[in-house]
Amino acid sequence: MACPLEKALDVMVSTFHKYSGKEGDKFKLNKSELKELLTRELPSFLGKRTDEAAFQKLMSNLDSNRDNEVDFQEYCVFLSCIAMMCNEFFEGFPDKQPRKK
Amino acid sequence: MACPLEKALDVMVSTFHKYSGKEGDKFKLNKSELKELLTRELPSFLGKRTDEAAFQKLMSNLDSNRDNEVDFQEYCVFLSCIAMMCNEFFEGFPDKQPRKK
């Protein structure tokens, strides 16, 4: 059976394609596909921020090549940013840490 | 229950700390910690490449700030690279794709 980290990477890939495959370029997320992915797959990250301007800003921040879509590399950068936010939270709670070195 | 993608991000964070917490700086992976993480958590990625030179090269590639350790951001870049490799493999097999748009 795949190790948890390998499974996690597989989930990252399959989740992207679950939504990128809906309309337009099947290897990129357009705004509505990104919106659906965030709403359904990352509800904790989104919270109450579902207004149009917030989505537009997020889309713009992720879209580094400015083609109005989010490709897999841009999506990975995004997930890394969320992971880094989670990590900062994790590091802020020493009692939740692995043992001290 | 957390969505699979949120769980995947959680696994990324917890796996890092499972190994970074063993020796030295508890928020960074030294060479032996990275070696152990790769061997145990990413065996499919590693394959037969367990020679010292390969590890040194990988460590050097990941260690962008040249401090001889891999911090969480560098680890995220690494995982993103693996995910992008997985994605290229995924995109190369149209029959495994979500439905055509």
Epitope: K31, Q56, S60, S64, R66, N68 | -
Partner: antibody, heavy 120, light 107 residues
Framework: QVQLQESGPGLVKPSQTLSLTCTVS?????????WNWIRQHPGKGLEWIGH???????NYNPSLKNRLSMSRDTSKNQFSLKLSSVTAADTAVYYC?????????????WGQGTLVTVSS | DIQMTQTTSSLSASLGDRVTISCRAS??????LNWYQQRPGGTLKLLIY???RLHSGVPSRFSGSGSGTDYSLTISNLEQEDIATYFC?????????FGGGTKLEIK
């Protein structure tokens, strides 16, 4: 109200480097926008030069890329353009603009423009 | 690069007329088309983005339409202050490119 103001020398000698700065006021110099340079040759159309945006991400027009350098100073609400090895063909009105985050990333605010003449 | 073509470089019309300015892209730009106005001796102002969305503060007599490669800007009731040059611009991909402009004059 957002305002952009270009500044820099109006006359540059051939082969030298053209340097322009744009100062943004009335809005914080946030990551939500990309900041562009666009030029208009005398009596002609518009040419996009490049932009700088989120996380310092920079994109240049490939036709100018080898001579271009862009940077920003968020503490001063400024971004800058350097174009090296200029020729008479670089004589133009240079505009700095803000690129909105809305669909199609339109240029929603423009500076007044500054005429740069390349001549010896 | 995507080429943007405004076939009509100048256009004469009377005040009160309905005026249409066209723009063609060399490939499908998926409605990522923006329109700008440049009055004589002045800077540029955004009028319409994403084919048909009116930028804030722009009078409702301006409207945009189109899809694929063909787009147009319409001024429903021409006023004196609309005398200007109009540029289309694609926001579909980099590098951003503009049409050559259409200069609107009074008959």
């Amino acid at each position: 109200q957002v305002q952009l103001q270009e500044s820099g020398p109006g006359l540059v000698k051939p082969s030298q480097t053209l340097s322009l700065t744009c100062t943004v006021s009335g809005d914080s110099f946030t990551n939500d926008y990309y900041w562009n340079w666009i030029r208009q040759h005398p009596g002609k159309g518009l040419e996009w030069i490049g932009h700088i945006g989120y996380g310092g991400n920079i994109n240049y027009n490939p036709s100018l890329k080898n001579r271009l350098s862009m940077s920003r100073d968020t503490s001063k609400n400024q971004f800058s353009l350097k174009l090296s090895s200029v020729t008479a063909a670089d004589t133009a009105v240079y505009y700095c603009t803000r690129e909105s985050f809305y669909d199609g990333y339109p240029f929603d605010y423009w500076g007044q423009g500054t005429l740069v003449t390349v001549s010896s | 690069d995507i080429q943007m073509t405004q076939t009509t470089s100048s256009l004469s019309a009377s005040l009160g007329d309905r005026v249409t300015i066209s723009c063609r892209a060399s490939q499908d730009i998926r409605n990522y088309l923006n329109w700008y106005q440049q009055r004589p001796g002045g800077t540029l102002k955004l009028l319409i983005y994403y084919t048909s969305r009116l930028h804030s503060g722009v009078p409702s007599r301006f409207s945009g339409s189109g899809s694929g490669t063909d787009y147009s800007l319409t001024i429903s009731n021409l006023e004196q202050e609309d005398i200007a040059t109009y540029f289309c611009q694609q926001g579909n991909s980099l590098p951003r490119t503009f049409g050559g402009g259409t200069k609107l004059e009074i008959k």
